[in-house]
């Protein structure tokens, strides 16, 4: 026989020959970095037709890297589903705690010996630091001076020194999340109110009241013979102003006896399919909407349209 | 939390064959191996084996080769154990358990009784 | 194949006393990186088997620190510094360096 195979997990005991007689036997052993777990036979023959008898290395195993729990509160997972050297332990923690250290560890040879490349990290709670403190209000547990992961804390205003009281502005309640960090912003408080909304030729038909503070919503709408212009509900936003705008009552023209040119529908004021009436932003048309509110035919003003692109 | 829940009792004739089942959950099936310990009446524990859930990758003990199968089936997260021509010394509590080669039981199953009897 | 004996294969014991466990290797189970090789398991009546101490010494998730393994090569000692009820069962050593196997287990009862 000629030399016997090689194999990458074990290597020949000696010095290969350039020949071997009939009979003669070989013995491996496992390779730096392998260990040999029985029973499989690590030995060939060279047999009479001038091969080896059939023999593998499936008894030598890579060395493997010490068992590393599960951090307390977390997850350690190999990767590559093996603690064998080359490959990787992952660790990750459970939901409310964050990781101190390595996140992934190797599995390293160094000699013949299998070790991880560091130590294995922790998984410590997820604490935040108090809430920011706000102007004319407070906060729940203002007295804690540490707060765990999820704990939430709710803000309220104070009472106002004046006739108007104090609105709460943004979220009321916020909680500790995953970074340390709280979920929003802190909310403010501070004095909102709106004008007395007024729209001629129309009238208000819900959200009555003397005051309007924040979040205040009224609901308008037109006189006979005359259409909305905005949006038919408003409501009084963090900087004292109606949004959408106060809408106006325009009059309705009355139905002019020229026939209109034919329009295309790319002259609308939105790629929707409502009225110009009930667009709240984008440019104005200067024709008005006749009163049947079917946006494909306008009536121009006076028979004509100002301008056509 | 991490489980390894087993397949039911079973009678077995001598000579027939038994599978039974080890159904994970709570971790990544496919990152550790199963082993498979048994347990005759009122006697210690017996390592059967190991599967690598990862490879497919087997080891079985001495005393079992050529008689006991290890398979896994990573789609359902469930290891297999599957014994043959059983004789009346088969009869035990069988175990899986979550570990490496090299490495430690840290999780069980609740075990499954096989008793081989005429 | 490596062998494990343990002694005393009973243990009778007293709630609050200390109890020990020695379990002998055929050969060494101190592998070249620095670490043995050696698991304790404790079996409680009816229950699975459940990890104790790994690698000879390190105690395992949500092992009370009454348990701790000591030793090296073929000596490896369990030690229960107070014993309580819930520890009565059937205490395993394993070894993990050739393949796995057991020793003969060491029954704790109360006295």
């Known amino acids: 026989c000629e030399e016997p195979p090689t194999f990458e997990a074990m290597e020949l005991i000696g010095k290969p020959k350039p020949y071997y007689e009939i009979g003669e036997r070989v013995d491996y052993k496992c390779k730096k970095g392998y260990f040999y777990i029985p029973p499989l036979a690590t030995h060939t023959i060279c047999d009479r037709n001038h091969t080896w008898l059939p023999v593998s290395d499936d008894a030598c195993y890579r060395e493997t890297c010490p068992y590393i729990r599960d951090p307390l509160n977390g997850q350690a997972v190999p990767a590559n589903g093996t603690y064998e050297f080359g490959y990787q332990m992952h660790f990750i923690c459970n939901e409310g705690y964050y990781l101190i250290g390595e996140e992934i560890l190797y599995c390293e040879l160094k000699g013949s010996v299998a070790i991880w490349s560091g130590k294995p990290p922790i998984c410590e709670k997820v604490l935040c630091t108090p809430p920011p403190k706000i102007k004319n209000g407070k906060h729940t547990f203002s007295e804690v001076e540490v707060f765990e992961y999820l704990d939430a804390v709710t803000y309220s205003c104070d009472p106002a020194p004046g006739p108007d009281p104090f609105s709460l502005i943004g979220e009321s309640t916020i909680y500790c999340g995953d970074n340390s960090v709280w979920s929003r912003a802190a909310p403010e408080c501070k004095v909102v109110k709106c004008r007395f909304p007024v729209v001629e030729n129309g009238k208000q038909i819900s959200g009555f009241g003397k005051k309007f503070y924040y979040k205040a919503t009224v609901m308008f709408e037109c006189d006979k013979g005359f259409y909305l212009d905005g949006s038919d509900t408003i409501v009084c936003d963090s900087n004292s102003t109606w949004d959408p705008p106060v809408p106006k009552c325009l009059k309705v023209l009355p139905p002019s006896s020229t026939k209109p040119p034919a329009l295309s529908h790319s002259v609308s004021t939105s790629s929707t399919t409502k009225s110009p009436a009930s667009s709240a932003s984008g440019p104005r048309p200067t024709y008005k909407p006749p009163v049947s509110n079917y946006p494909g035919y306008p009536k121009p003003e006076e028979g004509i349209l100002d301008s056509l692109d | 939390q991490v489980q390894l829940v087993q397949s039911g009792a079973e009678v077995k004739k001598p000579g027939a064959s038994v599978k039974v089942s080890c159904k994970a959950s709570?971790?990544?099936?496919?990152?550790?191996?199963i082993s498979w310990v048994r347990q005759a009446p009122g006697q210690g524990l017996e390592w059967m084996g190991w599967i690598s859930a990862y490879n497919g990758n087997t080891n079985y003990a001495q005393k079992l080769q050529g008689r006991v199968t290890m398979t896994t089936d990573t789609s359902t997260s469930t290891a297999y154990m599957e014994l043959r021509s059983l004789r009346s010394d088969d009869t035990a509590v069988y175990y899986c358990?979550?570990?490496?080669?090299?490495?430690?039981?840290?999780?069980w199953g609740q075990g499954t009784l096989v008793t081989v009897s005429t | 194949e490596i062998e494990l004996t343990q002694s005393p294969l009973s243990l009778p014991v007293t709630p609050g006393e200390p109890a020990s466990i020695s379990c002998r290797s055929s050969q060494s189970l101190l592998h070249s990186n620095g670490y043995n090789y050696l698991d304790w398991y404790l079996q409680k009546p009816g229950q699975s088997p459940q990890l104790l101490i790994y690698l000879g010494s390190n105690r395992a998730s949500g092992v009370p620190d009454r348990f701790s393994g000591s030793g090296s090569g073929t000596d490896f000692t369990l030690k229960i510094s107070r014993v309580e009820a819930e520890d009565v069962g059937v205490y395993y050593c394993m070894q993990a360096l050739q393949t796995f196997t057991f020793g003969p287990g060491t029954k704790v009862e109360i006295k």
């Open positions: 358990a979550r570990g490496m080669m090299r490495g430690v039981f840290d999780y």
């Open positions: 709570g971790y990544t099936f496919t990152s550790y191996g």
